[in-house]
Amino acid sequence: QTPLGMASGHIRDFQITASGQYGQWAPKLARLHYSGSINAWSTKEPFSWIKVDLLAPMIIHGIKTQGARQKFSSLYISQFIIMYSLDGKKWQTYRGNSTGTLMVFFGNVDSSGIKHNIFNPPIIARYIRLHPTHYSIRSTLRMELMGCDLNSCSMPLGMESKAISDAQITASSYFTNMFATWSPSKARLHLQGRSNAWRPQVNNPKEWLQVDFQKTMKVTGVTTQGVKSLLTSMYVKEFLISSSQDGHQWTLFFQNGKVKVFQGNQDSFTPVVNSLDPPLLTRYLRIHPQSWVHQIALRMEVLGCEAQDLY
């Protein structure tokens, strides 16, 4: 994860907007380490926000925040919440590992210190909006966004959104029980409901989940998530990835000359992003669970872009 460009200027002024500003303390000044007598975004409004348009979806791993000084006063944001969006219209509040309560981040305690808050799980978004909830004197901010993949090839390819249809998701087998079917099409990130994941008929390392993109895609990462019944956590700890152009001949993903064993989930709810380096150019993708807790259970998203987007 690297700085996305607030401090460097890679993120340009027009990409930074806000609900309002105090005097000349404009949104475009909200850049980590920015110096001068007016060197941050600031506002007196009680319900304010500052928004960054990254121009393309990014994986955002964290945010570094800093306050500012005005004469003898320390101005800073001590607590804030984060909202994010892929399209700028539909916004989600960042909740971390929780499905219920929103996550309140603890920010700065003075005007010069840098506080690094990590997003676990990471945020996949084009737009990110910070809403101050507690502040000293005025909401005042200099910041940097930490993330990766500025080539805009970290788009969710459609597992969660259902742009990838049920018919495109298949598996070696799936588990059915009375009134519950854990079919491949249930393997969608953040899916809710009774049987809200893919589970194979039996738990062994020969099982797989397959996605057919229906055309060649550049796959740069996968996000995996387990599932929890009332009392039982089920998730995949380790998995392999294989790919195919024709659906018949499969190649396992190698890194540094050997089959890459991906480190998956450590609980049933936190999405874990694994990047593919080098990226895969493939039509078909398979996940092969290798170790798991209680049962193999998988919800997932595939990250990437259309192959022709590269040219």
Epitope: N177, Q201, V202, L230
Partner: antibody
Framework: QVQLVQSGAEVKKPGASVKVSCKVS????????VHWVGQAPGKGLEWVGS????????IYAREFQGSVTMTADTSTDIAYMELSSLRSDDTAVYYC??????????WGQGTMVTVSS | EIALTQSPGTLSLSPGERATLSCRAS???????LAWYQQKPGQAPRLLIY???TRATGIPDRFSGSGSGTDFTLTISRLEPEDFAVYYC?????????FGQGTRLEIK
Amino acid sequence: QVQLVQSGAEVKKPGASVKVSCKVSGYTLTELPVHWVGQAPGKGLEWVGSFDPESGESIYAREFQGSVTMTADTSTDIAYMELSSLRSDDTAVYYCAVPDPDAFDIWGQGTMVTVSS
Amino acid sequence: EIALTQSPGTLSLSPGERATLSCRASQSFSSSYLAWYQQKPGQAPRLLIYGASTRATGIPDRFSGSGSGTDFTLTISRLEPEDFAVYYCQKYGTSAITFGQGTRLEIK
């Protein structure tokens, strides 16, 4: 925490009906199916049937078809099992249970139904 | 409908010994659908194993399950005084659910 609390013991005459309740707490009734298991005194476990409060669908054991009805009141999170045309060999402890995730991980405390003239 | 037969009917062992309980099905089915329960007098059954070999939450690792097809086994590696009870195998799944008749594990 997740709990199933059943109604109290019942004494019924042959030919009568009995309705046993199972109140769930710690989750919403529609999240999981409810299974019912009977156990005659000194005997083994016998599956009576299963009910899905979400769809209203039920599956009954062959031996109980025609004499059992399973229902639920989702507004109060209570599942019910009604046995009709009771006979003395229906005397048993009846348990409600829910699958978590697959087998019966959570059980009620049991309701003793005695059928006696 | 699949019938399950448990053996032995009664097993007499001492604390510290190993117990092996058998469950045989009248026809083959996926091990994904086999469970084992423990029941003590006056109590509801308690799930030990599901999917033939997966321990339920909070079950000590001295309990293990194995088997496939028609033959399934519950093993208690080292008996503790609280393990003496009746054990039932169960076939669950998409249709009828059946239980074995039970194995009584008693102190020798």
